[in-house]
């Protein structure tokens, strides 16, 4: 299976909400003995690859934002601890999940990746990640909501 | 904080069955694995296995036949059942939560385990 | 099995100097490598994940580096309660496995 990023940037003015997705692509495999573990996590354009550097979000890790069900579950993360920090993730039962942040800030700035972890139990994890830039914009420039470019293309679409 | 804490009989006879249980408290016990893995006096370490929450189970193939890892959701415990026991098994047994495209990041303190008649 | 050859075995430094540990395994493990500190009669400690992500808590005097099959786990500067044994460990396979570790002792 693959992970798709449906858009590579979101540009989004200070104070608005944005949602970041990802979509699981490809053949999943549904049997018991296989769970997926999703996460969020802060990175750059590391050394080594795209999303291999781990950093929080708002001071939540990737173990705080991990979402973990079965092939046929829809999910979503402890909400106390993550709405305490205006984060949200969930997943639903078409491979596609997501983080929801809300009042963006300029420090919400920077690269955002989300991992796909396969555990099939007798087999090594198979990993996969997709990467997204979020650019948080102020002042008289910065778009009155959040425009967000396709992955394949890079015409914009207006997010309300 | 999630703790991890080993219990069971720290003498087990040649042939016997070695038991240990894990009791896992300041947190679920969902969303990852729980390894078991031990260490002999003055030695390195060695990864014996691992139970996934949902039930499923993984086993270092050296061991793999003397090995059972069972789960009690319920009690938020995990166990180890290592039978036909020799010498070679006496080591330090740890309990420790791993974490998927991670490593372990929680450890219980370790119980010794001896292997004499 | 993947294995994991570590070096030196033992590593005589002093408060301060800076210290430099080698993992190298068998065959390619990607970034997928972590480290771990043990203290004598202590359960070890997760220092490193994927090769150079410090765990929660870690002292950035810790850092990892290295992809592939070779690994190195540098102290900057040695505090005293850094002398112990350090294990690396590989998760791109089933059985994990670790090293044989590299004790760093007071000089």
């Known amino acids: 299976f693959k992970v798709a990023t449906p858009y590579s940037l979101y540009v989004c003015p200070e104070g608005q909400q944005v949602t970041l997705t990802c979509r699981l692509l490809g053949p999943v495999d549904k049997g018991h003995d296989v769970t997926f573990y999703k996460t969020w996590y802060r990175s750059s354009r590391g050394e080594v690859q795209t999303c291999s550097e781990r950093r929080p979000i708002r001071n939540l890790t990737f173990q705080d934002l991990h979402l973990h069900h079965g092939g046929h579950q829809a999910a979503n993360t402890s909400h106390d601890l993550a709405q305490r920090h205006g984060l949200e993730s969930a997943s639903d039962h078409h491979g596609q999940f997501s983080i929801t942040m809300r009042n963006l800030t300029l420090l919400d700035s920077g690269l955002y990746c989300c991992l796909v972890v396969e555990i099939r139990h007798h087999h090594s994890e198979h990993r996969v990640h997709g990467a997204m830039e979020l650019q948080v914009q102020t002042g008289k420039d910065a778009p009155s909501n959040c425009v967000v470019y396709p992955s394949s293309s890079q015409d914009s679409e207006n997010i309300t | 904080q999630v703790q991890l804490q080993e219990s069971g009989p720290g003498l087990v006879k040649p042939s016997e069955t070695l038991s240990l249980t894990c009791t896992v408290s300041g947190g679920s016990i969902s969303s990852y694995y729980w390894s078991w893995i031990r260490q002999p006096p003055g030695k390195g370490l060695e990864w014996i296995g691992y139970?996934?929450?949902?039930?499923?189970?993984n086993y270092n193939p050296s061991l793999k036949s003397r090995v059972t890892i069972s789960v009690d959701t319920s009690k938020s415990q995990f166990s180890l059942k290592l039978s036909s026991v020799t010498a070679a098994d006496t080591a330090v047994y740890y309990c420790?939560?791993?974490?998927?495209?991670?490593?372990?990041?929680?450890w219980g303190q370790g119980t010794m385990v001896i292997v004499s008649s | 099995e993947i294995v994991l050859t570590q070096s030196p075995a033992t590593l005589s430094l002093s408060p301060g100097e800076r210290a430099t540990l080698s993992c190298r395994a068998s065959q390619s493990v990607s970034y997928y490598l972590a480290w771990y500190q043990q203290k004598p009669g202590q359960a070890p400690r997760l220092l490193i994940y994927d090769a150079f992500n410090r765990a929660t808590g870690i002292p950035a005097r810790f850092s990892g580096s290295g992809s592939g099959t070779d690994f190195t786990l540098t102290i900057s500067s040695l505090e005293p309660e850094d002398f112990a044994v350090y294990y690396c460990q590989q998760r791109i396979n089933w059985p994990l496995t670790f090293g044989g570790g590299t004790k760093v002792e007071i000089k």
């Open positions: 139970i996934y929450y949902s039930g499923s189970t």
């Open positions: 420790a939560r791993d974490i998927p495209a991670s490593a372990f990041d929680i």
